[in-house]
């Protein structure tokens, strides 16, 4: 489901496999059009932060929610399980208020125990008035939060305020920060895994721990994969993000946790409030800190982080800006890679991974991170693959 | 009609696997998922597992979890349960089912595997 | 884990008498249960879905009621053919068995 930045006309998607473009209503109608399926592959998305289920019609050519009539947990898994998350991970199944929808995808109980899309048909009713809201792993929740505190020149962060941040060793030295996003998957930033450094036995994660001296060997977790962003460009940063799958799954607990990634159809607000956390310096030049460190920051709207003044149209749609251009609260070195998250609906969504920027908190050169949100359906797919 | 026609008794030692084979006629077999029952001499049914033939997706008990594959080929529209180490209690009927997110509709006829040393 | 119990565990019953087997839910599993038929050396043959819809070419002797966590397979009048073991099965979060009513006759 390719409709952001993809190479076809307005009516056309691409193939990842070949590049080719197939026509929208060829998309998730139960026959394979591209080489490797993957236009069978994501018929499922989760929509909104209130994480509504909802399947594309290739019919309509278009998302429509799922009327809660008939549902059960079973097929709640079965569309998780569709979008890259193992069943093991499986929260719960809510149900929304359908707030004004007028199009469904509703269960055809009398088209007997077909697969799932097979039995979902069009309608411009839904009886419960409620529509499927589906928790594919239960992130985004944290103990209460940092006190104010900031990465450089500032506190430490609370026990458990950031559980999904993790810490990416080489040969028992702090090299980059990471977000946890299922038991077995971190999100980190490309520039972390350039050559040779993309090989996964050079690394161990660290969870749920925040003084690097407690770090030892035998807390870790090796990695067993290491999977850079294909159009990673290491001169412009642009899609610098990468993924690490854990040789073995974490145990999550009250410090160790997921964060959410974000679903379309959230929109980002200029001068969001948002959190960066990592064990990067506490001032240019300076070393990697010993504690984990937090800082608000606030976002940067694209178009005025591209101005002359700024950054001067080097910021891609695959980045996003956050801090302040005055200065002084930024992320620094030893911070990339790690989580830039912002709270909506008492849940804690990562939009972006440390990435680069202009020395260190310095005015009008904020931080710049990956663009998580244009990233998703990349790592949903890479999830997938994996089985 | 559709039919499920299972592969036949099997007898193996402790240790080993078994491969059962669930053989599908008179319908369209990517519609649907399969799922194995099994069912011990003189007990009750217990679900095992279940795989979309759609696109492979597998869902199996905790119980098996390890030790159990389920895999479908559908140039020749048959499913394969494969369960290895086997335990003497694992004596059992095995069957296949046609369905694989709700209820199971028709089944196989069953096929009897004996786990003796 | 949802568990199912089925009472009573064996029914004794005229032929032409009626017969009510009932299943309960640990925990609801709202419509989604099915009844299943067995005879001896046989598979299971589906009887009811979604609680009380009748499968295909069931005899209209064999309704299904109930939601939530209570049900009830209901056989009219028993034809000689009906004696049986009987199973329910809840499919809204995995997959339950009951452990059976064996329907014997009197």
């Known amino acids: 489901w390719k409709f952001m930045g993809s190479k076809c006309s307005n009516s056309g998607i691409e193939c990842d496999s070949s590049g080719t473009c197939i026509n929208p209503s060829n998309w998730c109608d139960g026959v394979s059009h591209c080489p490797g399926g993957e236009d069978e592959n994501r018929c499922v998305r989760l929509y909104g932060p209130n994480f509504i289920l909802q399947v594309y019609s290739s019919q309509r050519k278009s998302w429509h929610p799922v009327c809660q009539d008939d549902w059960n947990e079973n097929y709640g898994r079965a569309a998780c399980r569709d979008m890259g998350y193992k069943n093991n991970f499986y929260s719960s199944q809510g149900i929304v208020d359908d707030s004004g929808s007028t199009s469904f995808m509703k269960l055809n109980t009398s088209a007997g125990n077909v697969d799932i899309y097979k039995k979902l048909y069009h309608s411009d009713a839904c009886s419960s008035k409620a529509v499927v809201s589906l928790r594919c792993i239960a992130c985004g929740v944290n103990l209460n939060s940092s006190r104010q505190s900031r990465i450089v020149g500032g506190e430490s962060a609370l026990p458990g305020a950031w559980p999904w941040q993790v810490s990416l060793h080489v040969q028992n030295v702090h090299v980059c920060g990471g977000s946890i996003i299922t038991p077995e998957w971190i999100v980190t930033a490309a520039h972390c895994v350039e050559k040779p450094l993309n090989n996964p036995w050079h690394w161990t994660a660290f969870a749920g721990i925040l003084r690097q001296s407690f770090m030892f060997y035998g807390a870790g977790y090796q990695v067993e994969k290491v999977i850079s962003h294909p159009n990673y460009d290491s001169k412009t940063k642009n899609n610098d993000i990468a993924l690490m799958k854990l040789q073995k799954p974490l145990t999550f607990n009250d410090l160790v946790k997921p964060v959410c990634l974000p679903n379309p159809g959230m929109m980002l607000q200029p001068e969001q409030l948002c959190w960066i956390s990592g064990w990067g310096a506490t001032e240019e030049k300076g070393k990697t800190s010993e504690v984990l460190n937090a800082a608000k920051v606030l976002l940067i709207e694209t178009q005025r982080c591209n101005s002359r003044y700024v950054y001067d149209n080097l910021i891609t749609p695959a980045m996003i800006c956050a801090g302040f251009l005055q200065g002084n609260v930024d992320s620094c070195q030893g911070d990339s890679g790690g989580p830039l998250v912002t709270s909506k609906n008492n849940i804690w969504w990562l939009i972006g991974d440390t990435s680069w920027g202009s020395g260190c908190a310095k005015a009008y050169r904020p931080g710049v991170y990956g663009n998580v949100m244009v990233f998703t359906d990349w790592i949903y797919r890479q999830m997938r693959a994996d089985g | 009609q559709v039919q499920l026609v299972q592969s036949g008794a099997e007898v193996k030692k402790p240790g080993a696997s078994v491969r059962v084979s669930c053989k599908a006629s008179g319908y369209t077999f990517t519609n649907y998922g399969i799922t194995w029952v099994r069912q011990a001499p003189g007990q009750g049914l217990e679900w095992m597992g279940g795989?979309?033939?759609?696109?492979?997706?597998?869902e199996y008990a905790e119980k098996f979890q390890g030790r159990v594959s389920m895999t479908t080929d559908t140039s020749t529209t048959t499913a394969y349960l494969e369960l290895r180490s086997l335990k003497s209690d694992d004596t059992a009927v095995y069957f296949c089912?046609?369905?694989?997110?709700?209820?199971?509709?028709?089944w196989g006829q069953g096929t009897l595997v004996t786990v003796s040393s | 884990e949802i568990v199912m119990t089925q009472s009573p565990a064996t029914l004794s019953v005229s032929p032409g008498e009626r017969a009510t087997l009932s299943c309960r839910a640990s925990q609801s599993v709202r419509s989604n249960l099915a009844w299943y038929q067995q005879k001896p050396g046989q598979a299971p043959s589906l009887l009811i879905y979604?609680?009380?819809t009748r499968a295909t070419g069931i005899p209209a002797r064999f309704s299904g009621s109930g939601s939530g966590t209570e049900f009830t397979l209901t056989i009219s009048s028993l034809q000689s053919e009906d004696f049986a073991v009987y199973f329910c099965l809840q499919y809204n979060n995995w997959w339950t068995f009951g452990q059976g009513t064996k329907v014997e006759i009197k």
């Open positions: 979604g609680a009380s």
């Open positions: 795989i979309s033939v759609y696109n492979g997706n597998t």
């Open positions: 089912a046609r369905g694989q997110l709700d209820y199971f509709d028709p």
